[in-house]
């Protein structure tokens, strides 16, 4: 039975040209986290596990940095980076937990962090 919950940074906004940290945290489960995937829509951005370390897709390597922790840092943001991002926690024996973050990249300096929320 899957008992865990994923807490994410929720709906966030950031300025064009700036950077943002995408963060997820899995709690309320004793399952092993065997791998974390970061995806943007259907594109795999990065993977991390202890056998592999961090691996960033070559398409994003200039603008995506691993961490902090199991999070992901997006740099040199463009308006095209606006959209949904998913952290996918592969665990044993529970299975897969997915967290969703919506990022809006703004032209002006009105960017403001949204509230944190939980996804069961």
């Amino acid at each position: 039975m899957m008992t865990g919950t994923i807490e994410t940074t929720g709906n966030i906004s950031a300025e064009k040209g700036g950077s943002i940290i995408l963060q997820c945290h899995l709690s309320s489960t004793t399952a092993q986290v065997t791998q974390v995937n970061w995806e943007q829509q259907d594109q795999l951005l990065a993977i991390c596990n202890a056998d592999l370390g961090w691996h960033i897709s070559p398409s994003f390597k200039d603008r995506v940095a691993p961490g902090p922790g199991l999070g992901l840092t997006l740099q040199s943001l463009t308006v095209n980076d606006t959209g949904e991002y998913f952290c996918i926690y592969h665990t044993y024996p529970d299975g897969t937990y997915t967290g969703r973050i919506f990022l809006e990249v703004l032209e002006s300096s009105v960017a403001e962090h949204g509230a944190r929320f939980q996804i069961p």
Epitope: N49, A50, D51, I56, S57, P58
Partner: antibody, heavy 122, light 107 residues
Framework: QVQLVQSGAEVKKPGSSVKVSCKAS????????ISWVRQAPGQGLEWMGV????????NYAQKFQGRVTVTADESTSTAYMELSSLRSEDTAVYYC???????????????WGQGTTVTVSS | DIQMTQSPSSLSASVGDRVTITCRAS??????LNWYQQKPGKAPKLLIY???SLQSGVPSRFSGSGSGTDFTLTISSLQPEDFATYYC?????????FGGGTKVEIK
């Protein structure tokens, strides 16, 4: 059933390089990474590095950083490990091993190549 | 890097004996531990993953236990084909590291 088939034994001079291949027979590299592990005569297992073929990106043990290069050719499902500036201490059996990506990552290295003996001698 | 220490480094046992091998991590690794068996001239073979889960096709006389820093591989009744070297490996923190191995020999 996926098998990893490695290239044959090599004898090399100190200071030279060796390139060992590892071909996935009966399967592809989709959803897998390939690790490289070596074993000196009478010694234990030593992890060297890993490649994720879908990205073509590799990470290495600090001890081998700058001297080892791991690559993969997805079209032929073959991974390669090149070790340069060889010395006598590099005499060992070199193994490739499969790692699952994603949900089955907990398995660890569940399929291994047969090993390639590399002898470094002047 | 996390250091993995196995004990004993070698042991002699007879067919039918119960054999216990221990592995200690230099820091807590939860249950992120695998065990491998290696016979002379052969590649290692995965026996146990996640500290206690038996890999498909591995006989049930093999079992693993432990979490945190201390782990055990037990062979409940040693068979002739079990004479080999056994390695533990942590996959909690990159890079993965192996123990030094325990050689199980015939008494």
């Amino acid at each position: 059933q996926v098998q990893l088939v490695q290239s044959g034994a090599e004898v090399k001079k100190p200071g030279s390089s060796v390139k060992v291949s590892c071909k996935a027979s009966g399967g592809t590299f989709q959803n897998y990474a390939i690790s490289w592990v070596r074993q000196a005569p009478g010694q234990g297992l030593e992890w060297m590095g890993v490649i994720v073929p879908i990205f073509g990106t590799a990470n290495y043990a600090q001890k081998f950083q700058g001297r080892v290069t791991v690559t993969a050719d997805e079209s032929t499902s073959t991974a390669y490990m090149e070790l340069s500036s060889l010395r006598s201490e590099d005499t060992a059996v070199y193994y490739c091993a499969r790692l699952h990506l994603g949900q089955k990552a907990y398995y660890g290295m569940d399929v291994w190549g047969q090993g390639t003996t590399v002898t470094v001698s002047s | 890097d996390i250091q993995m220490t196995q004990s004993p480094s070698s042991l002699s046992a007879s067919v039918g004996d119960r054999v216990t091998i221990t592995c200690r991590a230099s820091q807590s690794i939860s249950s992120y531990l695998n065990w491998y068996q290696q016979k002379p001239g052969k590649a290692p073979k995965l026996l146990i993953y996640a500290a206690s889960s038996l890999q498909s096709g591995v006989p049930s006389r093999f079992s693993g236990s432990g979490s945190g820093t201390d782990f055990t591989l037990t062979i409940s009744s040693l068979q002739p084909e079990d004479f080999a070297t056994y390695y533990c490996q942590q996959r909690y923190v990159f890079p993965p590291t192996f123990g030094g191995g325990t050689k199980v020999e015939i008494k």
